[in-house]
């Protein structure tokens, strides 16, 4: 005869574990049903009655089969510099990612906790290291023979055009100006862009530049105290 299927709650055989989607209740000393994603345990099981599950309330969720007494709170609403890429539902937390032109300065398990704008390199400076989803742009001064005349988070320093006869010599922020004879170039004309996963910074914030001579350096500090705890609020 086939073995009889036990219905929850049931006492497990000594040395055996509860089945998939069941948990062992220490108080009842029985294998009991877990609650499905989107639910939580409203009443724990006893020796004679199984777990009673209830749906998560608004702005709360459970993503896994569980026996938690309360659902988890969804993270706070996405800020103005973020895009909600996954909504808060009963089965999943809200996920916020940075909008174009911003990078994730502080990640969390899923999505981003703090976005900051990508730096724009001013004229005379070009992109030394492009911004990524999780790192800022690094700018550097244009070396002799190169220039950048844009304020951009993607443009690198490009070579001055080579003139047969120079009318105005180039500098770090301006291309050379040739006399009417055709110039030759070591690179094709037009701005040179670096490929990067985040698009150029929007008009959301504007830099207020001050004079600059030193190349930009990234801030590498030793690990310190944790950042502030994340706020949690309903919709």
């Amino acid at each position: 005869l086939p073995a009889q299927v036990a219905f929850t709650p049931y006492a497990p055989e000594p040395g055996s574990t509860c089945r998939l989607r069941e948990y062992y209740d220490q108080t009842a000393q029985m294998c009991c049903s877990k609650c499905s994603p989107g639910q939580h345990a409203k009443v724990f099981c006893t020796k004679t009655s199984d777990t009673v599950c209830d749906s998560c309330e608004d702005s709360t969720y459970t993503q896994l089969w569980n026996w938690v007494p309360e659902c988890l709170s969804c993270g706070s609403r996405c800020s103005s510099d973020q895009v909600e890429t996954q909504a808060c539902t009963r089965e999943q937390n809200r996920i916020c990612t940075c909008r174009p032109g911003w990078y994730c300065a502080l990640s969390k398990q899923e999505g981003c906790r703090l976005c900051a704008p990508l730096r724009k390199c001013r004229p005379g400076f070009g992109v030394a290291r492009p911004g990524t989803e999780t790192s800022d742009v690094v700018c550097k001064p244009c070396a002799p023979g190169t220039f950048s005349n844009t304020t951009s988070s993607t443009d690198i320093c490009r070579p001055h055009q080579i003139c047969n006869v120079v009318a105005i010599p180039g500098n770090a922020s301006m291309d050379a100006v040739c006399t009417s004879t055709s110039p030759t170039r070591s690179m094709a004309p037009g701005a040179v862009h670096l490929p990067q996963p985040v698009s150029t910074r929007s008009q959301h914030t504007q830099p207020t530049p001050e004079p600059s001579t030193a190349p930009s350096t990234s801030f590498l500090l030793p690990m310190g105290p944790s950042p502030p705890a994340e706020g949690s609020t309903g919709d």
Partner: nanobody
């Protein structure tokens, strides 16, 4: 060891001003960027302003024209001058290195009449 210590927070009426300070030890401001971030009650973190190693400054739209970030290299301190304060500026303000490896403990700013 690098440390960032904020000060200057307090209770102020709408339209008032405060100046926050972020004293940095163990790292030079001439080679590093500092940001100000805030967290309003029950809300997530919000970027406020950045001052880069070369003194270039950036501001969030919500504070542009009202807040000014500056620094004193001799004192290795970054300041956030906050004018025309509004109730929605109420938050804990933190300064951090732009790689966000190190944070200050925060200073509470409350704007209320």
């Amino acid at each position: 060891e690098v440390q960032l210590v904020e000060s200057g927070g307090g209770l102020v009426q709408p339209g008032g001003s405060l100046r926050l300070s972020c004293a940095v030890s163990g790292a030079s401001l001439s080679r590093n960027a500092i940001i100000w971030v805030r967290q309003a009650p029950g809300k997530g973190l919000e970027w406020v302003s950045t001052i880069y190693d070369d003194g270039e400054t950036y501001y969030a739209d919500s504070v542009k024209g009202r807040f000014t970030i500056s620094r004193d290299l001799a004192k290795n301190t970054v300041y956030l001058q906050m004018n025309s304060l509004r109730a929605e500026d109420t938050a804990v303000y933190y300064c951090a290195g732009s790689a966000f490896d190190f944070w200050g403990q925060g200073t509470q700013v409350t704007v209320s009449s």
